[in-house]
Each structure stands twice: as structure tokens, then as C-alpha cells.
Amino acid sequence: DAHKSEVAHRFKDLGEENFKALVLIAFAQYLQQCPFEDHVKLVNEVTEFAKTCVADESAENCDKSLHTLFGDKLCTVATLRETYGEMADCCAKQEPERNECFLQHKDDNPNLPRLVRPEVDVMCTAFHDNEETFLKKYLYEIARRHPYFYAPELLFFAKRYKAAFTECCQAADKAACLLPKLDELRDEGKASSAKQRLKCASLQKFGERAFKAWAVARLSQRFPKAEFAEVSKLVTDLTKVHTECCHGDLLECADDRADLAKYICENQDSISSKLKECCEKPLLEKSHCIAEVENDEMPADLPSLAADFVESKDVCKNYAEAKDVFLGMFLYEYARRHPDYSVVLLLRLAKTYETTLEKCCAAADPHECYAKVFDEFKPLVEEPQNLIKQNCELFEQLGEYKFQNALLVRYTKKVPQVSTPTLVEVSRNLGKVGSKCCKHPEAKRMPCAEDYLSVVLNQLCVLHEKTPVSDRVTKCCTESLVNRRPCFSALEVDETYVPKEFNAETFTFHADICTLSEKERQIKKQTALVELVKHKPKATKEQLKAVMDDFAAFVEKCCKADDKETCFAEEGKKLVAASQAALGL
């Protein structure tokens, strides 16, 4: 339904608090380098303008699109060119090209300082002094570092952030109360950001059809009792929500997400028996809860799939009449029967089915041609099953840190041109699949592991896209969304790689390593491991293990020494010499 003033419509729907928060998120995701107070000022100006439009929808400029209003506001920033360079050229464009231009300049790895957590007392004082500004700063800092963070979900995180400070700043032991909650929010936030980044990549790089296929498979697993028409309606609405958020239309996205949650709860009887608790919660919690809800039980006595999709003589007729609808029904029927499969596997099966029908429906005897199509699925199903079994065994044998190291070596040998920080970050995250998924029973392992790996490999893809250095990464990232993981798994050692020159500075360590947290210390060691492999890509596992064991002993010894810095200098030289000898450098 058309509104005279879009900005007034969204202000009224969302309320002032959510409106301001979402505009702040939008602005911080576009202009990631601007200081906090500049954004606050711009948001306040937009909010005041929105209020005039609520009072009189016919007032000047109230009929303008949100992109026009927001874009005009962003283009008033005086230092646009000196801070953002060519992004300033966006302001010479008209909508919708201007917004597309801003979107293209979003930076997945902005050059921003690491967020350092102040002392608990300092945070509590700041929270009590100015709660509203404290929470705005949280939204701003997360949004600018995660320019595709799912905005309505970030409001949910902010609500939990506020609740943590409200509770813990009154506690006897503030730190014991607050720090675990902040750690949990940080870890969940990173995971949420990465999951949303994959959704946006899916929409932006592979199109709406790819996203809809993903959504059909996932929602059919989650809501196996729902009819195909119901799932299709949910998929259409969900696609609209994510298209809006990924496109920077955060007010529309949040509004439509609230409408979708309302619809789901009003129709839960025909969707899922697992929604009752979610639907009793307030809006932000409700939407989050629905997004994370467990799979409903499969209906009893579902007929064999073969009847409709292989044995029926109408397969080609039904396919020809409405290809995407028929393939959607196949995906729905297969997914609701297989909560034990990853979404990407289900999509590979659907693609195989589609390719077979394309070929066979043009053949002399279509039925004869596609009669054995389900046999083609067997190796596709077994490949991830075997891979997960092998890797979970390795994880259980090694533990998380050493499992990460094994993956670091594996991926550095596959794509040694990728920057060391990216290889460390991605391999560490790949390694987390062990503790995240291997504890699950067989029936839950594959959806947990392979769909998580899709999220992590997408991080590699978006970081690599910013500074492409490897044709192999580009190939795996761009050829097929659902085959990214098999593509990376299939990569062998890059024989064309010319080993990096040895640089002793890379392997020089100082006493500051002793004061680092265990995680930071691991990252230092893993960085050194990647550099070792880049110097000596043909090094064996045994050689690398020996060097890493020596390195760990060296750090431990020098951190216990009285004169730590001297120890690091002297013992470090010996270690480098011994490592070079061991690896034949």
C-alpha cells in the first residue's frame, strides 16, 4: 500500500526508539570511518525531519524516498572525499545508482582499531552516566565493523547488552556477572554477522533464486508439517526481508520482519508445533526465537519421493509447466524428510535432479533416462558424511587448537597466496566446527558442520574479493554457491607457488607474548605456523610439529625467565637456526 510519506510511515510503524537505532545502524554501515558524534547528529536531524512528516505528510520533502533522504544526508559529510576517497563520487549520482554505489563501497574488513574492553567499573559508570548514549555507541561500533549485520537482530543484541549492564552493574561482583555475558554476546554477534553475510552474498552474487532455494530447503526442514504453499509464502516474505536488509533498507527490513513474525505466530497451527514459546515473547525476542527454533517433528507415514518425482509418467509434463515450482516442490519434499542433511547437500541434490530432467525430458524415452536419478544422489550424500566422520575423528584425537593447526597447514598449502591474517582467522573458524558439531549425534552432524563451513568459507570469499590474490579461491567462491566447500576440499597443494623468502623478523618474538591471553598467544603461534608453511610448503607434518613443539617450549621457557627480553632475543636466534636446519631452509 502506498503512503504519502515513506519516512512518516516507517517512523509510526517502528516507533522513535527503533527508528533512531536503525538509522544509526544504516549510517554506520555505510560511512564506517565517521566518528560516533557525527552519526548521532545526522540521526537526530533525520529524526526531527521524520517527526515533521508524521505531523504533516504533505510537508516539504516528506514524499521523498528513504534512499533519497538518507543519501542526501550522508552526502553532507564534509570529509567524505578525504576519508573515503572514491566513495565520494557516489554523491554525484542519482538514486537508485547512488545507493548501489554506497553498497559497493561497504568494507568487510575496515581499517578500524580493535575494540578494547574497558575496566568493568569504567563501563558501569559510563552506562549509568548516559545509558542512551552508551547503547548507541554499542550499535555504532558493531555496525561499522560488520556492515552487513542483520539490523533488527542487532537491536536484539543491544537489548541483551543493556540487560547485562542493568543487572551486573548492581551486582556484588560486577566483573563475574558481566564479563561472561559480554563474551557470550561477542561470540554470538560474530556468528550472527557471519551467517547474515552469507545470506547477503547469496542474494548479491547468486541472485534471488539461489536465496529462495536455500530458504525453501531450510524452512522445509524446520517446518516439515507445513504445506508447500505455506512454506512458499514464508520463503517469499523472508526473501523480501533479507533483500531489504542486505540492500541497506533497514527500516523496511525491520518493519517487514516484525510483520512476518506476527504472521507466523498467528498461523502457527499450520506451520509448526514448536513456535508456542517463541510467540509469547516480546517482538525482538520473538523474531530471534523463531529464527532459531528447532525442527518440528516429521509427519508420520510420508510417502516415498520416487512416486511423484521418478515413477510418475507426468514428471516431464509437470516440470515443463512450471519448472521452478516443480523443483521447489522436489526440494520441499526432500528437505522435510531429511533434517539430517545439510541445506547445501539438499541444494546439490536438487541441482542434480534439475540437470537430469533438463537432459532427460528432451530424450526419446524420458522415463528410462531419469529412472535411476536417485542413484546419482548416493555419492553426493556419502562425500560430506565421510568427510565429517574423518574430521571429527581427527578433532577428537587432537583437540581444538591442534585441529585448527592441521587445517591451517592444509589451507595454507592449498591457497598460500592468501594473506596470513585471513588464513589464520578462517582456519581458526573452520577448526571450531569440531567443538560445535562433533558432539552431536550422527543425525545432526551434517547440517551443523556443512552449513557452518559454508558460513566460514564465505568469510574467506568476501575477504578475498576485496584483495584477490588467488585464482583458485576466486574459482571456488564464484562458480557455485553450494559447491564451495567441496571445491575447497578438492584443492590439492598449489604446486605453482613460489615459496616466500625467509625473513627472520617474522619469527622474532618478544616478552609481550607472555602477557597475552591464551587465545592471543595461540594466534601468534598460528601466525608463525602459516608463515613457516609459506616458506616451506613441502614441509611434512612431522617437521612442522617438531618446530611448533620447539616453539611452544621456547615461549614457555622465556616467559618463566627473570630477564624475559634477553631470553627471547638469545633463545629466539637459536630457535630460528634450529628450525631452518630442521626444515632445510
Partner: nanobody, 123 residues
Framework: EVQLVESGGGLVQPGGSLRLSCVAA????????IGWFRQAPGKEREGVSC???????YYADSVKGRFTISRDMAKKMVYLQMNSLKPEDTAVYYC?????????????????WGQGTQVTVSS
Amino acid sequence: EVQLVESGGGLVQPGGSLRLSCVAAGFTLDYYAIGWFRQAPGKEREGVSCITSDGRTYYADSVKGRFTISRDMAKKMVYLQMNSLKPEDTAVYYCAAGACMGGSGYEADFGSWGQGTQVTVSS
């Protein structure tokens, strides 16, 4: 409540130096830019220098190379070191909290003001 108090003004000879201080009470410098403004007799108030919450600095052309803005987050202090002072720098200097918006300061971008401190450059 946001409160700003300036100090450090006085009488100085041309070519001399002064260091103005601004203490910020009731808020944290993490959330605001602090700007220094001045108003000479019979003239409009003008932006002199500005420092953002993340430490970026801006200066009016007339003071570039002579004035330096800095801050001490722990003490909630912002300083304006003024060197090579000229008679035309004579004015009441105010500090204010708000947003630099990428410049040395526009009054409209600042919501909270101090009372001001007099700087006189004369031989």
C-alpha cells in the same frame, strides 16, 4: 548533565604562547567531539579547532601550524596549545561539546558550551 569549564586565558605578547584547558564534567569524551571557538569584539563566533571522539583533529586555516588541540581521556580534559600568537587572535575562547562534522567547527553542531575564557594578545 554536560558541563564545560575553560581556563588558561590571559594577557600575552605577540609571538607568545598560551595553553587553554577545558574540563568536561558529566559525560565522557568517547561520545562527543570537543571544539574550540572564539568571538572577537564586534565579530561573529568562529570555529578554531576540533577533536573528534576517535581523536581526529581539524583546524581553521587562520590557526593551522600555530595551534594544537589535544586531550587526556582519563582526566576528561581537552587542551588548546596556542603558539606564535597574533593580535588578531584576541577573543573570548569557548569550548563546546558536539560533532565536528569534518571541520574546525560550526556552532550549529555543538549543543553544550562553556562560559569562555578571555585571551588578549597585545604588546
